[in-house]
């Protein structure tokens, strides 16, 4: 049984599955939003499409105490090859430009759907 247990354990999640799950989580957030998401917190906007996962995580990780986006933060970290901590500022961000978390999540969902349709899973 011990040996068989090795075969039964799940392997790495394919990128397409991980992206689909992230999209589903964002759909969940946008559809179930009643009060302002994360109390209307603001995050840094992004002005480029390359390195988007890390940049998105760098923005969202600065929102603390918002359980609604904690799963999204964890999922995004799986797409970002380096460790991201609060306070990091990527060149992808638009300095002095912040947008509401709700809009950020909505826009992230739009972009990820495009990537999924185009087959860009990484």
């Amino acid at each position: 049984l011990t040996c068989l247990g090795g075969f039964a354990s799940p392997g790495p999640v394919p990128p397409s599955t991980a992206l689909r799950e992230l999209i589903e989580e964002l759909v969940n957030i946008t559809q179930n939003q009643k009060a302002p998401l994360c109390n209307g917190s603001m995050v840094w906007s992004i002005n480029l499409t390359a390195g988007m996962y890390c940049a998105a995580l760098e923005s969202l990780i600065n929102v603390s105490g918002c359980s609604a986006i904690e799963k999204t933060q964890r999922m995004l970290s799986g797409f970002c090859p380096h460790k991201v901590s609060a306070g990091q500022f990527s060149s992808l961000h638009v300095r002095d430009t912040k947008i509401e978390v709700a809009q950020f999540v909505k826009d992230l969902l739009l972009h990820l759907k495009k990537l999924f349709r185009e087959g860009q899973f990484n």
Epitope: T49, K106, L110, H111
Partner: nanobody
């Protein structure tokens, strides 16, 4: 909130040129397909041009092909429309807008008036 602010309109003589700009804020401009639409006096709304989010694919209405050029600068959150060889029939209010098929992603500017007259 989301804002799209057009500028660059005005009065120009036939054959002249204008460059319209649209400054975007409150959303992630770089991830949106964008476009320009226009409404001539007493006419309906007409899409003039669209550009994909990465800027590598553009579309033009037949009426402006070869005369108008759409472009974008994602680092500046700005959309442009270069209009050359202007004609009287190009007179209209020009609107900057998101060009997404996805419901709920429809944002429009207030418009800028372009008048082509001698």
């Amino acid at each position: 909130g989301v804002q799209l602010l057009e500028s660059g309109g005005g009065l120009v003589q036939p054959g002249g040129s204008l460059r319209l700009s649209c400054a975007a804020s409150g959303f992630i401009f770089a991830w949106y397909d964008m476009g320009w639409a226009r409404q001539a006096p007493g006419k309906g709304l007409e899409w003039v041009s669209r550009i994909t989010h990465h800027g590598n694919v553009t579309y033009y209405a037949d009426s402006v092909k070869g005369r108008f050029t759409i472009s974008r600068d994602n680092s500046k959150n700005t959309l442009y429309l270069q209009m050359n060889s202007l004609r009287a029939e190009d007179t209209a209010v020009y609107y900057c807008a998101t060009a997404e098929d996805e419901p709920g992603y429809d944002y429009w500017g207030q418009g800028t008036l372009v008048t082509v007259s001698s």
